[in-house]
């Protein structure tokens, strides 16, 4: 609450996060033309990346394009990309939607469709829907430990969200344990009024707000965090503005002296930890 | 504008960026002693990295040191690094400019020059100039979509830079489309009075400032972003302070049971999105 | 100092860091059942990662789990994880401390101990102590160059911490060279009253605070940074809250058509650069 006689100072903050959990993923795997059900285990090294303190990312879904090589091939026949003759294909043209540079030739993509040939990582990425339900939907049960160190330099005051008295096997709950800083990902979504299973398909951005309203006067000292949660990406966003949250990354390797890559389109939740508040002192 | 009767509050912000574009790179490739012209395609997975929201990086140039192995070899004969006898080489010494630890021996680097032998990733990186023009100079035509969600918690007000009425095929223009949040990288540089082609060689840091000056009073409500651009690295910087923007990363692999790496010195533009402003309410 | 007649504005900041240094690492390496002393060189591409401006990470220690494959194996017999019969193992159960999903069978881990079988990356990671002393303890002698560009948009004022008059071979010292922006990592720890050698074992978080107290009035203009250092992680933290600073990442590869990975648990120092301050003008 506003105490007008106090000198207010904004918080200086540092955050450290630690995600825990394992996901079992079942998906169709094609090898040598044969498709069978594959099971795999994903642990933190597989689904998260060494990110900065104020953000962490949990992969909840993915689409893989394996064994890509730099060569010429027909581009993917997405809407409006088909051709019937070379006239439709412009040598040197880079369509922002496409994944390569056109050679000027119209070539067969499959039995029925022809598309412009491109110089690209081939075969080009298929524009297929993200798997539904999400492959790592069980990430809902992962937990994240959030450590937050704050400082009011003008008041020479430092504290942190984890106190020595806290129990490391707690789980945050708005009513029963509002000071616990271990959060179940599914609970974060529930608190924000969002459906984890749904968001996990396309990905999204979730804000974890940590509000410090600190009274640093000795006679009525109070300085503890208050946690709240809100979705930061626009779930009603138009297709053209890229809804959800995803990015592409590649694993490069050599096979028979040929440079290849596996392209992964990773969908997931980026959690942004937004720390704010003030310290006031007479 | 300052309304002194209003209660002002700083903005809490979250940013999400999405880069689009393909570059065709032509460079000399040496294989088995034969040098020929190589063409390759770079897409987002090749030239950008999964970074946090407030920053994104676009590689515009690079120097590769392929097939490095941990062993002994002569260090690169940069200025002042040559020797004529072992006396000039100090066992265990690590010159900050060097890439290894000296063994104490002065050995031939080539026909005419001798340098201190080092324990290092060999052959050591050649200190050659960044290619000019930059290999991915066509990155000038890449575009970036910037999504910005802002919050004034004290006023319980949230909004974003992308409105439902916006057109996903727009391109930002200061006069004709100042609310479009899709930016052509070359335009950003032009607005900042900088030459993309020049900066792309050594790399640099570009600031995209998003200023929210929000009047949240219902009778004169206004809350839209204003974009501006300025170069953040010092183009006149002394050599000793590492001008431009680059970093080294490695791709590790095994060949004939020998651990090897390809070292990439990546030059590029780091774009920092700096969101600031206040929300005022009576 | 507070000048009440001035209009104050918070700083908008961008940071760029560059770490320099080489470490020689000596460790026991086991190959083909034979253990011998291995020496290796780590340079910036090996011990640091391309991170955002406000944070950089230096790996000071690590534990490797090489040649992991997705299959079934006994889990690591940490405290409380041993079993004597299948009744103790619950099919489908994921213990947050474990690295896999239980199959329901109790199987031999070694001659004397049995643990629950798991579907996981096998063999599962051994929960061994971080090496002491830290493998890259010589990182104490690494240096970091910090470039900081600041802006007070309301006052239309921009400056940076590195001035044209500065000497690129300086090293920061609180008394002798307080404006030099090249810092020896060991000195940062010493200034913060911490022991680098000790922290390097488990890792930690170190804050580098850059305080700009700028008087922008022409008649008494002053705008230079003041550097200070403080440890941000809690060194007295309970085991259950994961003391220190570490993260796991993996290097994936194929061997005889089998997907494998090397898991690296990287301990190190995350340096957070916390820039704050105000610009005041009449």
């Amino acid at each position: 609450s506003d105490k007008l006689y106090q000198r207010k100072e904004p918080v200086i903050s540092s955050v450290h996060t630690k995600v825990k959990g394992i996901a079992e993923v079942t998906e169709n795997v094609t090898e040598g033309g044969v498709t069978k059900l594959g099971h795999s285990i994903f642990d933190t090294a597989d689904y998260t990346f060494p990110l900065q303190g104020n953000s962490f990312f949990v992969m909840t879904n993915y689409v893989k394009s394996e064994g890509q090589v730099q060569t010429l091939c027909p581009e993917y026949p997405r809407r409006g990309a088909q051709c019937s003759s070379d006239r439709r294909c412009k040598k040197g043209w880079m369509d922002p939607q496409s994944k390569g540079i056109q050679t000027g030739r119209c070539v067969p993509y499959d039995k029925t469709r022809k598309t412009c040939e491109v110089s690209a990582w081939c075969p080009t990425e298929e524009e297929k829907e993200a798997p539904r339900p999400a492959l790592l939907r069980s990430a809902e049960n992962f937990t994240v430990l959030i450590k937050n160190n704050i400082h009011f330099p003008g008041h020479n005051y430092t504290t942190r969200n984890i106190l020595p008295t806290m129990n490391g096997s707690c789980t945050f709950h708005k009513t029963w344990d509002p000071q616990c800083s271990i959060f179940r990902l599914g609970d974060i979504f529930q608190e924000a009024g969002e459906n984890f299973t749904e968001v996990a398909v396309q990905g999204g951005i979730m804000g974890i707000e940590i509000y410090w309203d600190c009274n640093l006067d000795s006679w009525s000292h109070h300085c503890r965090p208050r946690y709240s949660f809100r979705r930061l990406d626009d779930k009603n966003m138009d297709e053209s503005f890229v809804p959800g949250y995803n990015f592409r990354y590649a694993k490069y390797y050599k096979e028979n002296n040929v440079e290849k890559r596996t392209l992964i389109k990773a969908f997931g939740i980026r959690f942004d930890i937004l720390v704010f508040g003030t310290g006031g002192k007479f | 504008s300052d309304k002194l009767y209003q209660r002002k509050e700083p903005v809490i912000s979250s940013v999400h960026t999405k880069v689009k574009g393909i570059a065709e790179v032509t460079e000399n490739v040496t294989e088995g002693g034969v040098t020929k012209l190589g063409h390759s395609i770079f897409d987002t997975a090749d030239y950008t990295f999964p970074l946090q929201g407030n920053s994104f990086f676009v590689m515009t140039n690079y120097v590769k040191s392929e097939g490095q192995v941990q062993t002994l070899c002569p260090e690169y004969p940069r200025r002042g690094a040559q020797c004529s006898s072992d006396r000039r080489c100090k066992k265990g010494w690590m010159d900050p400019q060097s890439k290894g630890i000296q063994t104490g021996r002065c050995v031939p680097y080539d026909k005419t020059r001798k340098t201190c032998e080092v324990s290092a990733w060999c052959p050591t990186e050649e200190e050659k100039e960044a290619p000019r023009p930059a290999l991915l100079r066509s990155a000038e035509n890449f575009t970036v979509l910037i999504k910005n969600n802002i919050h004034f918690p004290g006023h319980n007000y949230t909004t974003r830079n992308i409105l439902p009425t916006m057109n996903g095929s727009c391109t930002f223009h200061k006069t004709w489309d100042p609310q479009c949040s899709i930016f052509r990288l070359g335009d950003i540089f032009q607005e900042a009075g900088e030459n993309f082609t020049e900066v792309a060689v050594q790399g640099g840091i570009m600031g995209i400032e998003i200023y929210w000056d929000c009047n949240l009073d219902s009778w004169s409500h206004h809350c839209r972003p204003r974009y501006s651009f300025r170069r953040l690295d010092d183009k006149n910087m002394d050599e000793s302070f590492v001008p431009g923007y680059n970093f080294r990363y490695a791709k590790y692999y095994k060949e004939n049971n020998v651990e090897k790496r390809t070292l990439i010195k990546a030059f590029g533009i780091r774009f920092d999105i700096l969101v600031f402003g206040t929300g005022g309410k009576f | 100092s507070d000048k009440l007649y001035q209009r104050k504005e918070p700083v908008i900041s961008s940071v760029h860091t560059k770490v320099k240094g080489i470490a020689e690492v000596t460790e026991n390496v086991t190959e083909g059942g034979v253990t011998k002393l291995g020496h290796s060189i780590f340079d910036t591409a090996d011990y640091t990662f391309p991170l955002q401006g406000n944070s950089f990470f230096v790996m000071t220690n690590y534990v490797k789990s090489e040649g992991q494959v997705q299959t079934l194996c006994p889990e690591y017999p940490r405290r409380g994880a041993q079993c004597s019969s299948d009744r103790r193992c619950k099919k489908g159960w994921m213990d947050p401390q474990s690295k896999g999903i239980q199959t329901g069978r109790c199987v031999p881990y070694d001659k004397t101990r049995k643990t629950c079988e798991v579907s996981a990356w096998c063999p599962t990671e051994e929960e061994k102590e971080a090496p002491r002393p830290a493998l890259l303890r010589s990182a104490e002698n690494f240096t970091v160059l910090i470039k900081n560009n600041i802006h007070f948009p309301g006052h239309n004022y921009t400056t940076r911490n590195i001035l044209p008059t500065m000497n690129g071979s300086c090293t920061f010292h609180k008394t002798w060279d307080p404006q030099c922006s090249i810092f020896r990592l060991g000195d940062i720890f010493q200034e913060a009253g911490e022991n680098f050698t000790e922290v390097a074992v488990q890792g930690g978080i170190m804050g580098i605070e850059i305080y700009w107290d700028c008087n922008l009035d022409s008649w008494s203009h002053h705008c230079r940074p003041r550097y200070s250092f403080r440890r941000l992680d809690d060194k007295n933290m309970d085991e259950s809250f994961v003391p220190g600073y570490n993260f796991r990442y993996a290097k994936y590869y194929k061997e005889n058509n089998v997907e494998k990975r090397t898991l690296i648990k990287a301990f190190g120092i995350r340096f957070d650069i916390l820039v704050f301050g105000t610009g005041g003008k009449f």
Partner: nanobody, 115 residues
Framework: EVQLVESGGGLVQAGGSLRLSCAAP?????MGWFRQAPGKEREFVAG????????RYADSVKGRFTISRDNAKNTVSLQMSGLKPEDTAIYYC???????????WGQGTQVTVSS
């Protein structure tokens, strides 16, 4: 282009010995030997850094072959003993920047091991 001249190849019985020599026109940090058997790729055999430090051998020849260098004469030798029929190949001398990295190769000398 560096001209490397090999000598010492020939026909030898299994279990026998042979010594290959190679001269380089100028000093170089590392010198080594490669071989190529009919229908196979060229493979590394042995390498030596300046003054014989370090040395490196392929697993298949360890304990049987010894590489030695004379820096003053810019020469390298390969003493081969305990030869096997599978050692039959054209042997190439090479020079380079480390015992793992070679840039220049000679014309080769034939070694045939009969059973």
């Amino acid at each position: 282009e560096v001209q490397l001249v090999e000598s010492g190849g020939g026909l030898v019985q299994a279990g026998g010995s042979l010594r290959l020599s190679c001269a380089a026109p100028e000093r170089t940090y590392s010198m080594g030997w490669f071989r190529q058997a009919p229908g196979k790729e060229r493979e590394f055999v042995a390498g030596s850094g300046w003054d014989g430090i370090p040395t490196r051998y392929a697993d298949s020849v360890k304990g049987r072959f010894t590489i030695s260098r004379d820096n003053a004469k810019n020469t390298v030798s390969l003493q081969m003993s305990g030869l096997k029929p599978e050692d039959t190949a054209i042997y190439y001398c090479a020079t380079g920047t480390s015992v793992y990295h070679y840039q220049y190769w000679g014309q080769g000398t034939q070694v045939t091991v009969s059973s």
